[in-house]
C-alpha cells in the first residue's frame, strides 16, 4: 500500500518567526531507517528546506546549520522551523521515506500553509 502522510493544513508562525507542526506517517513496513524532508513549494518550484535521517527509536538530528529541529516518537515527527520571515510564507511539505530495510516507501503530505507575519517595530518610548 502507499504510505500516507498527514500534516496540518495551516500553521501560524510565532512573532519570533518559529513554526511547529506534526508530520505523521502510516508505515506499511517495519522501517529501521527513516528520512524526513521538509520541502517548500512556491508557484511550481519545489526547494528543500531541511532533511534528517534517523534510526527508529533514536532522535531526529538535522545538520548544525539547519533552520529545522525536530523530535520523533514512533511514526510521528514533531518539526520546528526557525528564523522565518513574512517572505517565507508558503506551503511546507513533509516528505517521509522509509530507507531501510527494503522495500523503499515514499510518502508525501499535502503540505502545511505556514503564515509568517513580521512583528511591528516597537515604538520609541520617551
Amino acid at each position: 500500500k502507499a504510505m500516507h502522510v498527514a500534516q496540518p493544513a495551516v500553521v501560524l508562525a510565532s512573532s519570533r518567526g518559529i513554526a511547529s507542526f506534526v508530520c505523521e506517517y502510516a508505515s506499511p513496513g517495519k522501517a529501521t531507517e527513516v528520512r524526513v524532508t521538509v520541502l517548500r513549494q512556491a508557484d511550481s518550484q519545489v526547494t528543500e528546506v531541511c532533511a534528517a535521517t534517523y534510526m527508529m527509536g533514536n532522535e531526529l538530528t538535522f545538520l548544525d546549520d539547519s533552520i529545522c529541529t525536530g523530535t520523533s516518537s514512533g511514526n510521528q515527527v514533531n518539526l520546528t522551523i526557525q528564523g522565518l520571515r513574512a517572505m517565507d510564507t508558503g506551503l511546507y511539505i513533509c516528505k517521509v521515506e522509509l530507507m531501510y530495510p527494503p522495500p523503499y516507501y515514499l510518502g508525501i503530505g499535502n503540505g502545511t500553509q505556514i503564515y509568517v507575519i513580521d512583528p511591528e517595530p516597537c515604538p520609541d518610548s520617551d
Partner: antibody, heavy 120, light 108 residues
Framework: QVQLVESGGGVVQPGRSLRLSCAAS????????MHWVRQAPGKGLEWVAV????????YYADSVKGRFTISRDNSKNTLYLQMYSLRAEDTAVYYC?????????????WGQGTLVTVSS | EIVLTQSPGTLSLSPGDRATLSCRAS???????LAWYQQKPGQAPRLLIY???SRATGIPDRFSGSGSGTDFTLTISRLEPEDFAVYYC?????????SGPGTKVDIK
C-alpha cells in the same frame, strides 16, 4: 543547466564485466538520488538501480541483484555502475537519470545513454 | 512488485486529434506517485507529468494527467506533429520503481 553524460559502454562477452560512468554537472550532485535505467533494443524502460544522496542506501532490480553494483563519488560528481557476470539479456542502452527533489523515484533529467552489447 | 499495464499498445491519430492514454496499476501502492514520460526514436525519455497530474517544467499545457489509486490517464488535448512518440507511465511510490510497456502514438 543539468547535464548527465554516460560512458563506458561497448561490446563484451557473456560472463565478463564492464563499468559504466555518468558525469554530472549543473546541479549539486550530492543532494540527489541517482539512478540507472536501461532499455533493451525495441523494448520498454527497466529501472536497474538507485543510490541515495550520501551513497549509504542502494536498491536494485531483482534481475541485476548480486551482479551489478551502483556507486557514486560526490567529490567527482560521478555515478558508476559496475556490471559483473554479464548475460545476453543485459544488452541495452543504459541511461543515468537524476531523481527529483520532490521524490527521488522521479527521473527528472536523463543522459543520452550508452549502449552495452553482450555477445560472444 | 507493482505491475503497470498501458493501453492501448498503439494509438493511430492525426495532428489536432485528442489522445487519451491509460495506465493501470496492479495495486494501489503507487497512490498518486505516478509519472509519465515521452520518448522519441533515438532519444532519452523526457519527464512530462509527476504526481499523476503535475506538469514538469517546460511541458506545454496540452499535456495533462489525471487519476489516483490504480487508474491513471494521460491526455494530449490537441496533437502536435512533435507529440508522435512512445509514452511510458512509471510508479515511484515503492521499490522496485516500475514502468508500463508503453503506448506508441503514431500518425494515422
Amino acid at each position: 543547466q543539468v547535464q548527465l553524460v554516460e560512458s563506458g559502454g561497448g561490446v563484451v562477452q557473456p560472463g565478463r564485466s564492464l563499468r559504466l560512468s555518468c558525469a554530472a554537472s549543473g546541479f549539486t550532485f550530492s543532494s540527489y538520488g541517482m539512478h540507472w535505467v536501461r532499455q533493451a533494443p525495441g523494448k520498454g524502460l527497466e529501472w536497474v538501480a538507485v543510490i541515495w544522496y550520501d551513497g549509504n542506501n542502494k536498491y536494485y532490480a531483482d534481475s541485476v541483484k548480486g551482479r551489478f553494483t551502483i556507486s557514486r563519488d560526490n567529490s567527482k560528481n560521478t555515478l558508476y555502475l559496475q556490471m559483473y557476470s554479464l548475460r545476453a539479456e543485459d544488452t541495452a542502452v543504459y541511461y543515468c537519470a537524476r531523481g527529483g527533489i520532490l521524490a527521488a523515484g522521479i527521473f527528472d533529467y536523463w543522459g543520452q545513454g550508452t549502449l552495452v552489447t553482450v555477445s560472444s | 512488485e507493482i505491475v503497470l499495464t498501458q493501453s492501448p499498445g498503439t494509438l493511430s491519430l492525426s495532428p489536432g486529434d485528442r489522445a487519451t492514454l491509460s495506465c493501470r496499476a496492479s495495486q494501489s501502492g503507487s497512490s498518486s506517485y505516478l509519472a509519465w514520460y515521452q520518448q522519441k526514436p533515438g532519444q532519452a525519455p523526457r519527464l512530462l507529468i509527476y504526481g499523476a497530474s503535475s506538469r514538469a517544467t517546460g511541458i506545454p499545457d496540452r499535456f495533462s494527467g489525471s487519476g489516483s489509486g490504480t487508474d491513471f490517464t494521460l491526455t494530449i488535448s490537441r496533437l502536435e506533429p512533435e507529440d508522435f512518440a512512445v509514452y511510458y507511465c512509471q510508479q515511484y511510490g515503492t521499490s522496485p520503481f516500475t514502468s508500463g510497456p508503453g503506448t506508441k502514438v503514431d500518425i494515422k
